[in-house]
Amino acid sequence: LKGQEFAPSHQQVYAPLRADGDKPRAHLTVVRQTPTQHFKNQFPALHWEHELGLAFTKNRMNYTNKFLLIPESGDYFIYSQVTFRGMTSECSEIRQAGRPNKPDSITVVITKVTDSYPEPTQLLMGTKSVCEVGSNWFQPIYLGAMFSLQEGDKLMVNVSDISLVDYTKEDKTFFGAFLL
Amino acid sequence: LKGQEFAPSHQQVYAPLRADGDKPRAHLTVVRQTPTQHFKNQFPALHWEHELGLAFTKNRMNYTNKFLLIPESGDYFIYSQVTFRGMTSECSEIRQAGRPNKPDSITVVITKVTDSYPEPTQLLMGTKSVCEVGSNWFQPIYLGAMFSLQEGDKLMVNVSDISLVDYTKEDKTFFGAFLL
Amino acid sequence: LKGQEFAPSHQQVYAPLRADGDKPRAHLTVVRQTPTQHFKNQFPALHWEHELGLAFTKNRMNYTNKFLLIPESGDYFIYSQVTFRGMTSECSEIRQAGRPNKPDSITVVITKVTDSYPEPTQLLMGTKSVCEVGSNWFQPIYLGAMFSLQEGDKLMVNVSDISLVDYTKEDKTFFGAFLL
């Protein structure tokens, strides 16, 4: 009798339960970027540290060749911060035909690549005009949100100008994802 | 027979399972910072509201003396926003020897202190140059990421200038962490 | 005897366990806002895409009439990014009687509405002065934190000026929440 009472309740939730500690997770940190060629009109991808310092990958979440590889389908929280730094951007000085300039800008995109799909999908974008007069400047762009991903999907972080990325400290520029 | 089939499966996942509702969690909100002395070249730590309004700590996550105390080892998502406000910062005016000024800046650091380790670890940093001409200014810096923490670790939020923190509303400046 | 040993241990964690995959979750993405009347001194709410592209709601988390409806009590992580864009804001140029102007600003608020409570609660606010000289500007405000919500609570995103919201891409402006 006791067994009969217990079984249905157990069956009701048993199948999908899984231990939190074995979920795929990664936190990647900045490394100095080696200048690389990239296609025109395509933002270059950052590469990352995946095991030293604060960085880690675990539970089958692997990092390879600028990509985080999603090992199982589910809903993931994905985040990144990129700190940019540059010299003065005198975007207010020169106007042609009375029109304001197209401003300088900095952009971060978190992109999903699915092998069976021809085009990458932009999941998150942070983009900011930069109009700093008279001094060096620096500022972060932070992004984070939840997405439904499929096993085999790949994630990368693209930036508008790799030469402006602050690669000096692992706490300034980073990229991570975890299965919810 | 049924019992024999069931036992191994149960043992397989039973040990690490735990209820989501009993995981350590905290969301702390800003209070006015009383002016206090701090060491030179060391960013002061903010103190926080931990039980009134939107603020809470639960499941053995405790707040004491500017620190969130980590009650069990695991992967935590940690976040903070600090809203800064100040008066005009005419950083573009004076250049020496044709060089741009070192700009004014605002910085937030989420720091981990481990008693067995001599130096605090900077987990997250958001830093931004401020070059606002002609008016009062205000802006937030947001940070958030996942880290592997150990029982007994302590977390704090440090800022570059405590006098520029907007302490007026609990939704503007906050700090939180939760076990994944 | 074996049953007696097993039962207490099972009872200890059984009741609150639940499958991660059936937790309420939503990620909403921007759509073009139709101009609507709103009360003076009250920020207008954005409406959202909830099923096309990257957007989804699941497990009884429903979207209706600008609100995300919370289907069960618990601790939720809530986030939003709004990208603003506008024309030059020459806030530094004109001063009356030597006094600085009140700066232009952009603000995002994530608000909770509880039917049994007369006033909405501001959970998160990101607010930034905008003083861009000489060019069009664009920039995101990102917010995210954990809150204890009750079944029936409603969440919305309010902005200071709906006409400045960049509605062009689903990765630039978004709103989400998930039960922890």
């Epitope: - | 006015r32 206090t36 030179k40 006098s163 907007d166 007026t168 | -």
Partner: antibody, heavy 117, light 107 residues
Framework: EVQLQESGPGLVKPSETLSLTCAVS????????WAWIRQPPGKGLEWIGD???????NYNPSLKSRVTISVDTSKNQFSLKLSSVTAADTAVYYC???????????WGQGTLVTVSS | AIQMTQSPGTLSLSPGERATLSCRAS??????LAWYQQKPGQAPRLLIY???RRATGIPARFSGSGSGTDFTLTISRLEPEDFAVYYC?????????FGQGTKVEIK
């Protein structure tokens, strides 16, 4: 435009309570703390204390036992009460806005309070 | 409480000259120091905060420097409207305290 205006009696008898009010206009009251500062004739400035829109106060320890600062958000005003006054409390009393934090960027024009019998 | 001491008590200068005012704290206040200007019959006006940051709308001839215990306010070329009393204020510790003032008068 931010404006602060002090009001209250200019003469108070010794041992009585000095009461002043500051009316605030042109600004969101809840975004700041609001302070009282005084200046005895020909002397320097002394911070008395401050308050926010929720009524949370900070007082100068040297005056704490005699000072009460209160707020009436419906009227956008805050008040100072200083009990058991003596001639040493004779001063110009200013109200001021605290921005961004423990600095005073807008001031009232000040009101002279004389303590005399 | 932190004591703030200003020197000199009075500074007699002509328009166009450079004025240098000093403020010393009894213990370190880091860079949490402000300067105010007060003219007769008027309320004080915030000039400098953070030891060296000019407040909104303050002319560039006013500059501040120093950190720790010793601070300086400099007026590069005195204008007629600059003759007034100047106060320093520390906001590193509670209670907030002001110096006794330096009067800048026309020579």
């Amino acid at each position: 435009e931010v404006q602060l205006q002090e009001s209250g009696p200019g003469l108070v008898k010794p041992s009585e309570t000095l009461s002043l009010t500051c009316a605030v206009s042109g600004v969101s009251y809840s975004d700041y703390h609001w302070a009282w500062i005084r200046q005895p004739p020909g002397k320097g400035l002394e911070w008395i204390g401050d308050i926010n829109h929720k009524g949370k106060t900070n007082y100068n320890p040297s005056l704490k036992s005699r000072v009460t600062i209160s707020v009436d958000t419906s009227k956008n005003q805050f008040s100072l009460k200083l009990s058991s006054v003596t001639a040493a409390d004779t001063a110009v009393y200013y109200c001021a806005r605290d921005y961004p934090n423990f600095l005073f960027d807008y001031w009232g024009q000040g009101t002279l309070v004389t303590v005399s019998s | 409480a932190i004591q703030m001491t200003q020197s000199p008590g009075t500074l007699s200068l002509s328009p166009g000259e450079r004025a240098t005012l000093s403020c010393r704290a009894s213990q370190s206040v880091s860079s949490h120091l402000a300067w105010y200007q007060q003219k007769p019959g008027q309320a004080p006006r915030l000039l400098i905060y953070g030891a060296s940051r000019r407040a909104t709308g303050i002319p560039a001839r006013f500059s501040g420097s120093g950190s720790g215990t010793d601070f300086t306010l400099t007026i590069s070329r005195l204008e007629p409207e600059d003759f007034a009393v100047y106060y320093c204020q520390q906001y590193a510790d509670s209670p907030l305290t002001f110096g006794q003032g330096t009067k800048v008068e026309i020579k």
